[in-house]
């Protein structure tokens, strides 16, 4: 058993039929010694008396706020939380595996640019008595400071049958060095606790493996002269990290028919202009990538031919 | 460039881009098999890293930027002589047209454009290398790799801004 | 074409070293380890060891250690292995192979130690 | 040391027959695993790496198989050309060991 935050305790059980549980001894926060009496949630039923109450947990039916009184009074409370163990590993119920880029891929985040700051989300299929709690760091031994707000929800989808719903939080390393090669990774660690099932989720990752740019801005068509061809211009988009000269991106520019059949042409150019040929009906998308180092490509910012 | 002179950043430039994309194609290289699981021992965590405080930053670069260059040639020496050792030259044979062969020269080439014969910076960091294992070796070379190609993005980016703002 | 040719049958008097030679030719003589094996007369293959041409590192088998030395010249794509202090036990032919999954070994190099 | 076990020792076929040579390691090698035949008077020839993967050069009736600690190599229908010593041999680690080998004869 550990202490989640004040009054709130996670209990560890290897989840199979039969399991013998672990036993756990609340102490009733008071100065008090007798005439102590303990109850479970809501209920009036009297579990025991005194200052300690000694208890087997075994399943969620063990699990919730226990509470000590005194003469009608309530003296403190102990909320109790189960942490399950399937098969000697933490069960994964309450957020949805996103299967990107890997199996057992629950925490997904991303940053626009080098300064520390990244976003990451998770799914779950659950809308109610549900909390999430995010803690980070960069490294794990002798961690460095990051500092994330609180997660919330950010989107709600519907899948088939289901809602699905995304929540998300927004992380900052304190002491960020955008220049400097990464050697040590930033961990991530989600709280989830649904009613009195705790579950906890984490990930690990450079910022470097994380990072899109947002889409080029300004995406524009000039016409060349007594020609098919145009001349395409873009800029870098606001949000990536400056100079330019130093944070360098590399481009693709594609030209799509209306028909996905269509063939794409592309090119690839590390300047913020190109020259294509403009189909009849066709758009003309660019997208953004880290030039010196393969991480993900922006989204597309597109322009119709015509 | 030892002794304050100033590196051919352009040459610089082209040939560190050059180190990004044969980093990130030699990567797929894992050999005879999959790479089963990475692993969590620490396989590469004496590699030099450009620091916080290596000056390779844009005002670090503008302020003396022999700091940030020795700092990478001292990275290229490192990993040119990783990639020499039998981490790469043993069992599970690399084929003979592997990116990692020219990944190699060009490492050379760029840290022979910083110090070229004759100029010295002091001594370098050199990899302890005992002889790896052939069943570690592939999980190695992922890791070595994987952390090449952060270093050279790095690198590529001094390189590029030193080209941008600091040539002649 | 791959080949390792090396160098002819050697008789030697108990005591006496010897230097055998192994030149590489059709690749990249520093891309690959050379490692030498040792075959007595109508028995099994033994790994003496190997040496890296790029930077000479070698690596022996604890069996062979003292009893072998293995060098290299990259001028000349040679790798060498010298045995010293020989005895009958160390009559054999021995050779030279390139990586183990590359299927390239030398003719070999007979040694026979007799008084 | 990890210590490669051949059987049989030797082993007499008829041209045509199927035939499967036993590799054991004393400790589980992966797939580590290479297999050569050593003709009377010839250097030893590479036939199979990594437990089953064929080389070029080597005609496909030899064929690699298992994982772990126990490896055979099959002939599916041998030949007068193929007597001669089959040797397997540990690739995981060092020291690198050789089986004892498996002749094999033609009746």
């Known amino acids: 058993i550990w202490e989640l935050k004040k009054d709130v305790y996670v209990v560890e059980l290897d989840w199979y039929p039969d399991a013998p549980g672990e036993m756990v001894v609340l102490t009733c926060d008071t100065p008090e010694e007798d005439g102590i009496t303990w109850t479970l949630d809501q209920s009036s039923e009297v579990l025991g008396s005194g200052k300690t109450l000694t208890i087997q947990v075994k399943e969620f039916g063990d699990a919730g706020q226990y509470t000590c009184h005194k003469g009608g009074e309530v003296l403190s409370h102990s909320l109790l939380l189960l942490h399950k163990k399937e098969d000697g590993i933490w069960s994964t119920d309450i957020l949805k595996d996103q299967k990107e880029p890997k199996n057992k891929t629950f925490l997904r985040c991303e940053a626009k640019n080098y300064s520390g700051r990244f976003t990451c989300w998770w799914l779950t299929t659950i809308s109610t008595d549900l909390t999430f709690s995010v803690k980070s760091s960069r490294g794990s031994s002798d961690p460095q400071g990051v500092t994330c707000g609180a997660a919330t929800l950010s989107a709600e989808r519907v899948r088939g049958d289901n809602k699905e719903y995304e929540y998300s939080v927004e992380c900052q390393e304190d002491s960020a060095c955008p220049a400097a090669e990464e050697s040590l990774p930033i961990e991530v660690m989600v709280d989830a606790v649904h009613k009195l099932k705790y579950e906890n989720y984490t990930s690990s990752f450079f910022i470097r493996d994380i990072i899109k740019p947002d889409p080029p801005k300004n995406l524009q068509l000039k016409p060349l002269k007594n020609s098919r061809q145009v001349e395409v211009s873009w800029e870098y988009p606001d949000t990536w990290s400056t100079p330019h000269s130093y944070f360098s991106l590399t481009f693709c520019v594609q030209v799509q028919g209306k028909s996905k059949r269509e063939k794409k042409d592309r090119v690839f150019t590390d300047k913020t202009s190109a020259t294509v040929i403009c189909r009849k009906n066709a758009s003309i998308s660019v997208r953004a990538q880290d030039r010196y180092y393969s991480s993900s490509w922006s989204e597309w910012a597109s322009v119709p031919c015509s | 460039v030892p002794g304050g002179s100033s590196p051919a950043w352009t040459q610089c430039q082209q040939l560190s881009q050059k180190l990004c994309t044969l980093a990130w194609s030699a990567h797929p290289l894992v050999g005879h098999m999959d790479l089963r699981e990475e692993g969590d021992e620490e396989t590469t965590n004496d590699v030099p890293h450009i620091q916080c405080g290596d000056g390779c930053d844009p005002q670090g670069l503008r302020d003396n930027s022999q700091f940030c260059l020795q700092r990478i040639h001292q990275g290229l020496i490192f990993y040119e002589k990783l990639l020499g050792s039998d981490i790469f030259t043993g069992e599970p044979s690399l084929l003979p047209d592997s990116p990692v062969g020219q990944l190699h020269a060009s490492l050379l080439g760029l840290s022979q454009l910083l110090q070229p014969e004759g100029h010295h910076w002091e001594t370098q960091q050199i990899p302890s290398l005992s002889p790896s294992q052939p069943w570690q070796r592939l999980l190695l070379r992922f890791k070595i790799l994987r952390s090449l190609q952060a270093f050279v993005a790095v690198a590529a980016r001094v390189f590029a801004h030193g080209a941008a703002t600091l040539s002649p | 074409e791959v080949q390792l040719q090396q160098s002819g049958p050697e008789l030697v008097k108990p005591g006496a070293s010897v230097k055998m030679s192994c030149k590489a030719s059709g690749y990249t003589f520093t891309r690959y380890l050379m490692h030498w094996v040792k075959q007595k007369p109508g028995q099994g293959l033994e790994w003496i060891g190997y040496?890296?041409?790029?930077?000479?590192?070698?690596n022996y088998n604890e069996k062979f250690k003292g009893k072998a030395t293995l060098t290299s010249d990259k001028s000349s794509s040679t790798a060498y292995m010298e045995l010293s202090s020989l005895t009958s036990e160390d009559s054999a032919v021995y050779y030279c192979?390139?990586?183990?999954?590359?299927?390239?070994w030398g003719q070999g190099t007979l040694v026979t130690v007799s008084a | 040391d990890i210590v490669m076990t051949q059987s049989p020792a030797t082993l007499s076929v008829t041209p045509g027959d199927r035939v499967s040579l036993s590799c054991r390691a004393s400790?589980?090698?992966?797939?580590?695993l290479h297999w050569y035949q050593q003709k009377s008077h010839e250097s030893p020839r590479l036939l199979i790496k990594y437990a089953s993967q064929s080389i070029s050069g080597i005609p496909s009736r030899f064929s690699g198989s298992g994982s772990g600690s126990d490896f055979t190599l099959s002939i599916n229908s041998v030949e007068p050309e193929d007597v001669g010593v089959y040797y397997c041999q540990n690739g995981h680690s060092f020291p690198y060991t050789f089986g004892g080998g498996t002749k094999l004869e033609i009746k």
């Open positions: 040496i890296n041409p790029y930077n000479d590192g070698t």
């Open positions: 192979s390139l990586n183990w999954d590359y299927a390239y």
């Open positions: 400790q589980s090698i992966s797939d580590y």
